[in-house]
């Protein structure tokens, strides 16, 4: 039997250095487009393979952006949070909110074939 | 979906005026322009205005007749000309910076990053 899912949630600074196609991820999110509900957040919603953030190697797909240099990404239209990246510079530092899945209870045994080994 | 709406061109006589707006929506917080562009001539820049509205520039040729200015609760702009002359009609476009909470405001068409369609002033 399976324990209850549960979340850790962590913050983390983190520094990019543009690069050539730029910071190399998507976002979703905004107070006109909400990606969570009741949360107009900025997501991570994608990394591109050889970018900047895949080779840091720190941001997640699925991590909350709360600031970029210093600016709130709170209550911000998308295009709004959009532009802030596009004109952020070279050298970038994204405050960040991980959300790590963690289960607590017993763990059932993982079965052969099993697609998350 | 960014978008800028320009209402308020027609046909006016010299020595009129008339009041241009341009609703914005999908961006916020933008540093705004008006320019202009006669048949067969460039665009030019006609007046900035800052994102807080603090802070407006004029081209010289339109210097106290015309007055840009902004209601950020209706995330509208407005260009408001007096004393026309023949040489002011064109189409009027409404341009919005590229950069969310800009600081400088300036007539390069290189900070305008979004544009509505235009509209025409006619002044016989």
């Known amino acids: 039997m399976n324990g209850r899912v549960d979340y850790l949630v962590t913050e983390e600074e983190i520094n990019l250095t543009r690069g050539p196609s730029g910071l190399g991820f998507n976002i979703v999110g905004g107070t006109d487009q909400q990606y969570v509900s009741n949360d107009s957040g900025i997501y991570v919603s994608r990394i591109k393979e050889n970018g900047a953030a895949a080779l840091d190697g720190r941001l997640q797909e699925g991590d909350k952006i709360l600031s970029v240099n210093g600016q709130d990404l709170k209550n911000l239209l998308h295009q709004d949070a959009v532009d802030l990246f596009r004109n952020a510079g070279y050298a970038v530092s994204l405050r960040v909110q991980h959300r790590l899945q963690v289960q607590n209870g017993p763990i059932g045994h993982r079965g052969e074939g099993d697609p998350s080994g | 979906e960014v978008q800028l709406v320009e209402s308020g061109g027609g046909l006016v006589q010299a020595g009129g005026s008339l009041r241009l707006s341009c609703a914005v929506s999908?961006?916020?917080?933008?540093?705004m322009g008006w320019f202009r562009q006669a048949p067969g001539k460039e665009r030019e820049f006609v007046a900035a205005?800052?994102?807080?509205?603090?802070?407006?520039v004029y081209v010289d040729s339109v210097k106290g007749r015309v007055t840009i200015s902004r209601d950020n609760a209706k995330n509208t702009v407005y260009l408001e000309m007096n004393s026309l002359k023949p040489e002011d009609t064109a189409v009027y476009y409404c341009?919005?910076?590229?950069?969310?909470?800009?600081?400088?405001?300036?007539?390069?068409?290189?900070?305008?990053?979004?544009w509505g369609q235009g509209t025409q002033v006619t002044v016989s």
């Open positions: 205005i800052s994102w807080s509205g603090d802070s407006t």
């Open positions: 999908g961006v916020s917080f933008r540093n």
């Open positions: 341009a919005a910076d590229g950069r969310f909470r800009a600081g400088q405001i300036g007539p390069s068409l290189g900070l305008y990053h979004y």
